[in-house]
Amino acid sequence: KGMHAAQPAVVLASSRGVASFVCEYGSSGNAAEVRVTMLRQAGSQMTEVCAATYTVEDELAFLDDSTCTGTSSGNKVNLTIQGLRAMGTGLYICKVELMYPPPYYVGMGNGTQIYVIDPEPCPDSD
């Protein structure tokens, strides 16, 4: 049956273009190293937004780049995407791989639809 990853169906990005959601996976109990990949699906195309590997026992920030930040706690991962614009609206899929030790497991979430609404520009004031 494979491992499943659970994530919310819908998230609304903030006015600053930031969206966060939790990705939770079914733990096999002995995974020490877990790789999390954020994928964006547009039509039939799937593109990688960001990815990182973390050590389960560390329970700390494992991902911090210009696009994503991530913190882990056990079998839950809190993912934040920043810099989103209206064009970034789409389905964001959480992929979790239990990398070490064997056995290898992979779980794909059903995706989180992130809605991004660009703020209206402020009218010029005289």
Epitope: K1, G2, R35, A52, T53, Y100, P101, P103, V106
Partner: antibody, heavy 114, light 108 residues
Framework: EVQLVETGGDLVKPGGSLRLSCVAS????????MNWVRQAPEKGLQLVGG????????YYTDAVKGRFTISRDNAKNTVYLQMNSLRAEDTAMYYC???????WGQGTLVTVSS | QAVLNQPASVSAALGQRVTISCNTN??????VQWYQQLPGKSPKTIIY???NRPSGVPVRFSGSKSGSTATLTIAGIQAEDEADYYC???????????FGSGTQLTVL
């Protein structure tokens, strides 16, 4: 472009030693535990063993336990396979691969013969 | 010890659909991966986690797993699909990864 390049394969006599290297590029090597897999001539694939991303933990198949050692140097993006007490049955193409087998090298040939 | 059993060879005409089975003698709960090995080349992952296809792998390749049998399906065989195909999973008895014996696919 992701690349794994194995080197060090050679013809060696039974009882001899050899060290294989696998240099990675095009991905964050330190994020990936690594495996070594071998394939005897005209035969199937067999796992040799693996190492975690930090290099602190390893595992081996029974056929090589006590003879082979896997290590890595993340600063050099390299994983190693030290092979001692080599036997004729160790003759194979040796591949390195990421622990999820997503990426594979092109292999290096080890021949053990007197 | 669990063994992943595959047919030694299968053949199919160009454009046909072919399936390759991978049977384990235990009802393994573990994920199955499939690899394609073209003549003289290193293996390439074509299916991971039973049914997931890496980017770049043609959509004609698909995988499934039910009970103790995993299946690789190639819908609409192309000449370039002629290769050896290996399944791989995890075996508690050896506490490690095991590979099937491989299936040679011939395109007629």
């Amino acid at each position: 472009e992701v690349q794994l390049v194995e080197t060090g394969g050679d013809l060696v006599k039974p009882g001899g030693s050899l060290r294989l290297s696998c240099v990675a590029s095009g991905f964050t090597f330190s994020d990936y535990p690594m495996n070594w897999v071998r394939q005897a001539p005209e035969k199937g694939l067999q796992l040799v063993g693996g190492i975690n991303s930090g290099g602190s933990a390893t595992y081996y198949t029974d056929a090589v336990k006590g003879r082979f050692t896997i290590s890595r140097d993340n600063a050099k993006n390299t994983v190693y396979l030290q092979m001692n007490s080599l036997r004729a049955e160790d003759t194979a193409m040796y591949y390195c691969a990421t622990s999820n087998f997503q990426y594979w090298g092109q292999g290096t040939l080890v021949t053990v013969s007197s | 010890q669990a063994v992943l059993n595959q047919p030694a060879s299968v053949s199919a005409a160009l454009g046909q659909r072919v399936t390759i089975s991978c049977n384990t003698n235990i009802g393994s709960p573990y994920d199955v991966q499939w690899y394609q090995q073209l003549p003289g080349k290193s293996p390439k992952t074509i299916i991971y986690g039973n049914s997931n296809r890496p980017s770049g792998v043609p959509v004609r390749f698909s995988g499934s797993k039910s009970g103790s049998t995993a299946t690789l399906t190639i819908a609409g065989i192309q000449a370039e699909d002629e290769a050896d195909y290996y399944c791989q999973s995890y075996d508690d008895n050896v506490d490690g990864y095991v590979f099937g014996s491989g299936t040679q696919l011939t395109v007629l």
